[in-house]
Amino acid sequence: FKVATPYSLYVCPEGQNVTLTCRLLGPVDKGHDVTFYKTWYRSSRGEVQTCSERRPIRNLTFQDLHLHHGGHQAANTSHDLAQRHGLESASDHHGNFSITMRNLTLLDSGLYCCLVVEIRHHHSEHRVHGAMELQVQTGKDAPSNCVVYPSSSQDSENITAA
């Protein structure tokens, strides 16, 4: 399987909420013998490899923000630690995996990475990641709502997040 990032760039006004999304593509095993570990972290855009550096999101590490669930389950972080920092990560049945950040500030701007580890018990392990950029803007040039830009270079149309 692979990880797709539907949007490569999110441009949001200060104070807004945003949900960053990754999506699992390809044959995703939903059987009982599969466990997924998923998490989010901040990084920097390296010359060779993005997402190699793992930095916290609002002081929460990728360990703090991780989800784990079986192939047939959905999951979300309901623990107080994440919510106290205005964060929640979630995963649904359809391969969508997201992190919601509330009350954005300029300090939230940067590169965000999702990491997925698929463990097929008695068989294998596979890990993949995706990256996207968040720009938080303030002042008269800031959009009134978050604007998202599709990852596909063919689709240059902007989509305003609901």
Epitope: Y37, G46, Q49, F62, L115, R127
Partner: antibody, heavy 120, light 106 residues
């Protein structure tokens, strides 16, 4: 501070089963974010991953050893084991137990290793 | 299985020299590669993960780089205490190790 300690016989006869135990202290083996594994190193040679067990009891084994390896876990004693059947002299090695963080990837904590010699 | 080919198998360098070790994967492993240091009689010690991230407490003279199939481990200024064998390991899939590089002082 997490510590892992291997124990078991230092001498095993050919064709018998090698049995080692790894006692984990300073952390719970039931933690969901970790694999607990065995790696071996023949004298003067490189490292070979043998297999790992997940907190739930599910396992991954090195395909080349799969038919001979079992890694049971005993969460009540906070320990896991290695059983390697039908041993030969080629199985003589220092055996390490180690922990792998699933999200980070590498083996981040290791036992000090125990030398097992296969000889009659 | 993903095969890891490490070279050289041994090297000898002077104190202060820059030492480079390479590791090649048989298929693309993104950046899911780690480097360990093993001193005689000891267990391996984690130095670098995700190809280039220095583990906490590891001296900054150690560094790693690379992506895909080709990776490099560098000791910027070799010190006497760096005499050891260094191993790479991939964790893109089930773990496999490189054959090791023994580093000695001239």
């Amino acid at each position: 501070q997490l510590q892992l300690q291997e124990s078991g016989p230092g001498l095993v006869k050919p064709s018998e089963t090698l049995s080692l135990t790894c006692i984990v202290s300073g952390g719970s083996i039931s933690s969901s974010g970790y694999y607990w594994g065995w790696i071996r190193q023949p004298p003067g040679k490189g490292l070979e991953w043998i297999g790992s067990i997940f907190y739930s009891g599910n396992t991954h084994y090195n395909p080349s050893l799969k038919s001979r390896v079992t890694i049971p876990v005993d969460t009540s004693k906070n320990q896991f084991s290695l059983k390697l059947s039908s041993v030969t002299a080629a199985d003589s090695a220092v055996y390490y137990c180690a922990r792998r963080d699933i999200l980070t990837g590498p083996f981040d904590y290791w036992g000090q290793g125990t030398l097992v010699t296969v000889s009659s | 299985d993903i095969q890891m080919t490490q070279s050289p198998s041994s090297l000898s360098a002077s104190v202060g020299d820059r030492v480079t070790i390479t590791c090649q994967a048989s298929q693309d492993i993104t950046n899911y590669l780690t480097w360990y240091q093993q001193k005689p009689g000891n267990a391996p010690k984690l130095l670098i993960y995700d190809a280039s991230n220095l583990e906490t407490g590891v001296p900054s003279r150690f560094s790693g780089s690379g992506s895909g199939t080709d990776f490099t481990f560098t000791i910027n200024s070799l010190q006497p205490e760096d005499v050891a064998t260094y191993f790479c390991q991939q964790y893109h899939n089930l773990p496999t190790f490189g054959g090791g590089t023994k580093v000695e002082i001239k």
